[in-house]
């Protein structure tokens, strides 16, 4: 069964910067990836980015840069302009549309124990998997 993983990281150097990593484990050709926050797109969540393998990407604030990391994974850099860090308590969702299998989506958030001062770059952040 195809699966989607979501990983949220706070940048150690900039407390206001976050990166969402999402990947698709399964067959088929990925046609579209939609990233949202506050819940799934269409269910109260707000769209942050849409990535198409051929036609490029579209992103909306506070998304800073959306890009493909591999043929089946993407990353989205976010810039938190506020003094506090609302991203820390936010759910991020990724939906992968693969033809002709269909769509799979998962949501994840920053692990509660995340301390940017202690997380060195090589340390892997737990992957949160939850097929909605």
């Amino acid at each position: 069964t195809p699966e989607v993983w979501v990983q949220v990281q706070m940048e150690a150097t900039e407390l206001s910067s976050f990166t969402v990593h999402c990947g698709f484990l399964g067959p088929g050709s990925i046609s579209l990836v939609t990233v949202s926050w506050g819940g799934p797109d269409g269910a109260g969540g707000t769209k942050l980015a849409v990535l198409h393998p051929e036609l490029g990407t579209r992103q909306w604030a506070p998304a800073r840069q959306a890009r493909w990391e591999t043929q089946s994974s993407i990353s989205l850099a976010l810039e938190d302009s506020g003094a506090s860090s609302p991203f820390a308590n936010t759910t991020f969702c990724c939906k992968f549309a693969s033809f002709p299998e269909g769509s799979w989506e998962s949501c994840g958030s920053l692990p509660p124990s995340s301390d940017p001062g202690l997380s060195a770059p090589p340390t892997p952040v737990p992957i949160l998997r939850a097929d909605l």
Partner: antibody, heavy 120, light 107 residues
Framework: DVKLVESGGGLVKLGGSLKLSCAAS????????MSWVRQTPEKRLELVAA????????YYPDTVKGRFTISRDDAENTLYLQMSSLKSEDTALYYC?????????????WGQGTSVTVSS | SIVMTQTPKFLLVSAGDRVTITCKAS??????VAWYQEKPGQSPKLLMY???HRFTGVPDRFTGSGYGTDFTFTINTVQAEDLAVYFC?????????FGGGTKLEIK
């Protein structure tokens, strides 16, 4: 203007074969996933075959698996459906349709349909 | 496969009425639901995608809502030209499946 024109339908004997064609124009055919959808005499719609834009991935429901084959020729801008071992329940109006990635794979263009009647 | 149960099968309404068609999926289909209109003698035409997004040229009297398993399609102020069969469609998981259709007739 996007245009899909099906052909190849007709009257065929039980167990016979037929090849449907769909000529596409007005868009970059190679950039789109395509499908064949049929409408039964009872007016129900059923997906019978789908093919990805690169032609590498195909899908068939169990009702036609092993009997129908979808293919595409991007140089000719044409979609095909090879049907064999036809059954009476394959009698339907067959539509060629285009899937739009940005619309959640909704079918944003359909042809006018070609009729297939399987008789005993 | 996912079953899309569409109700009602028939609707007889007067011009100017408000019409509501519902579609219930046998499992969650997220927001990957489209609605099509098939006028007599014509092929189906896309009206709505991602539940509530109107396709190009579709009048704003057509609206859609829902998420997960329950979806609603509404025609506000029905017009004579809306005489057609309407189908819901899930494109969330293969095989893409359709509702049984709702035939709208105008008095």
């Amino acid at each position: 203007d996007v245009k899909l024109v099906e052909s190849g339908g007709g009257l065929v004997k039980l167990g016979g074969s037929l090849k449907l064609s769909c000529a596409a124009s007005g868009f970059t055919f190679s950039s789109y996933h395509m499908s064949w959808v049929r409408q039964t005499p009872e007016k129900r719609l059923e997906l019978v075959a789908a093919i990805s834009r690169d032609g590498d991935s195909t899908y068939y429901p169990d009702t036609v698996k092993g009997r129908f084959t979808i293919s595409r020729d991007d140089a000719e801008n044409t979609l095909y459906l090879q049907m064999s071992s036809l059954k009476s329940e394959d009698t339907a109006l067959y539509y060629c349709s285009r899937h739009e990635d940005y619309f959640g794979f909704a079918m944003d263009s359909w042809g006018q349909g070609t009729s297939v009647t399987v008789s005993s | 496969s996912i079953v899309m149960t569409q109700t009602p099968k028939f609707l007889l309404v007067s011009a100017g009425d408000r019409v509501t068609i519902t579609c219930k999926a046998s499992q969650s289909v997220s927001n990957d639901v489209a609605w099509y209109q098939e006028k007599p003698g014509q092929s189906p035409k896309l009206l709505m995608y991602y539940v509530s997004h109107r396709f190009t040229g579709v009048p704003d009297r057509f609206t859609g809502s829902g998420y997960g398993t329950d979806f609603t399609f509404t025609i506000n102020t029905v017009q004579a030209e809306d005489l057609a069969v309407y189908f819901c469609h899930q494109a969330y998981r293969s095989p893409w499946t359709f509702g049984g259709g709702t035939k709208l007739e105008i008095k």
